[in-house]
Interface confidence: medium
Amino acid sequence: SERCDDWGLDTMRQIQVFEDEPARIKCPLFEHFLKFNYSTAHSAGLTLIWYWTRQDRDLEEPINFRLPENRISKEKDVLWFRPTLLNDTGNYTCMLRNTTYCSKVAFPLEVVQKDSCFNSPMKLPVHKLYIEYGIQRITCPNVDGYFPSSVKPTITWYMGCYKIQNFNNVIPEGMNLSFLIALISNNGNYTCVVTYPENGRTFHLTRTLTVKVVGSPKNAVPPVIHSPNDHVVYEKEPGEELLIPCTVYFSFLMDSRNEVWWTIDGKKPDDITIDVTINESISHSRTEDETRTQILSIKKVTSEDLKRSYVCHARSAKGEVAKAAKVKQKVPAPRYTVELACGFGAT
């Protein structure tokens, strides 16, 4: 057979589907690897072929499209399961070819079991809602294309194991779930179960996502440096260890990169010859506001080091701030017998 452009196993598209539910899986070639769509390929006389490798096997085999009730079928560039079975788990390959052209890609499909409370090994998408930000909605994901618009499915929403009804601030509205005013207690896993008829059978689609309530942009402020501050002076003798914490509070900001760094005499610690170590720790509030602490440490400080300028800097999408630490050399206590005697004119 002629050479085939093999895109390998596309592990970026680890597809997970629930057991005993319909699944429609588009061939990734047209979405991510080729510059033309299925219609164009079909018009040009290319044929799409599907095959698979079962879990824990090496042998590629054709997909059986002659199962009872057309349990597995292909429609254009979509592979359909109506419904899936646990042993459908494996690596699936779609190959586009004619006599002069060939391109193929494989992808893993995992059929997952769920319990009565929708718990499963499924990786859940996270949807962030702003705290106290007015009405916000989440939409039951990945249900497009399963039934025609003429079919009116029933949709039931759950929080964890509980059907959502008479919740204070959460209202099911068909495919949408509305949060009148998001609160931290709305954090959790939300599941929509979509039930629809097809050819005399009833199918269920289960979709779970995680809601995380985060700080609102209307409350967001530029970074706040809590330490160093004007109240604390780092007074050290040469030879002692100098430890200066830089503690910065960052409001939650979607997709903001929070940065904290020290400069010593205007330079980054990496660009200076003194032996400095910096340790960072990060903690988060219930609304994902972030506190970053970077502790600057000089094991044995010299009198030269105690004359340097130590500045903590912080930056987020809201702005940049800086604060200098007050560092000084401790004045040694007088040695009374010699120094005071000299002060009285004794020799």
Epitope: N168, N169, L183, S185, G188, T293
Partner: antibody, heavy 122, light 107 residues
Amino acid sequence: QLQLQESGPGLVKPSETLSLTCTVSGGSISSSTYYWGWIRQPPGKGLEWIGSIYFTGSTDYNPSLKSRVSISVDTSKNQFSLKLSSVTAADTAVYYCAKEDDSSGYYSFDYWGQGNLVTVSS
Amino acid sequence: DIQLTQSPSFLSASVGDRVTITCRASQGISSYLAWYQQKPGKAPKLLIYAASTLQSGVPSRFSGSGSGTEFTLTISSLQPEDFATYYCQQVNSYPLTFGGGTKVEIK
């Protein structure tokens, strides 16, 4: 008027498990803006948060006690419970259950039980 | 963990005095702070949440202020029933923590 009432033994032997139940009356434990918490106070000392639970069963625990603590909820009985294993004399305290309200967006323990003194002694 | 340092630990005052209690957080907690009053043998009672919002039914002589790391509880005119221990609590992040308490005694 919401009320919380702790119940359980007042005396527990060292190395055994302390078990307390909080019964909620005058309101539903399944309210979507409430968390339910346990707080303790050793004699003559300050308050220490043990953990909280939401009606769906999701929990948050104090890391200092996490390996020994378990909080559960029974919505049908409008109760939530605390279990603290391998107790020592240091666990002697008044144990309070409380409702943590989130309806304002800012939590606070606005309703408390009267407290249950648990002494760990052989 | 976020540490809360209350000062003073003890406070002697007379009826009618203006009393101020301070709570300092080891890191910024926005306005996620509550104040409680506790009398001997009783459960704590919520006075203020969100740093400055008075809980329903609490007398207006109690007020709270502050944000970030510095918070204050003020009793504008101390009444006989106000002699008690006061605790601050941060609800910003887990684990939830309380201050060490401030005991307000009769002078």
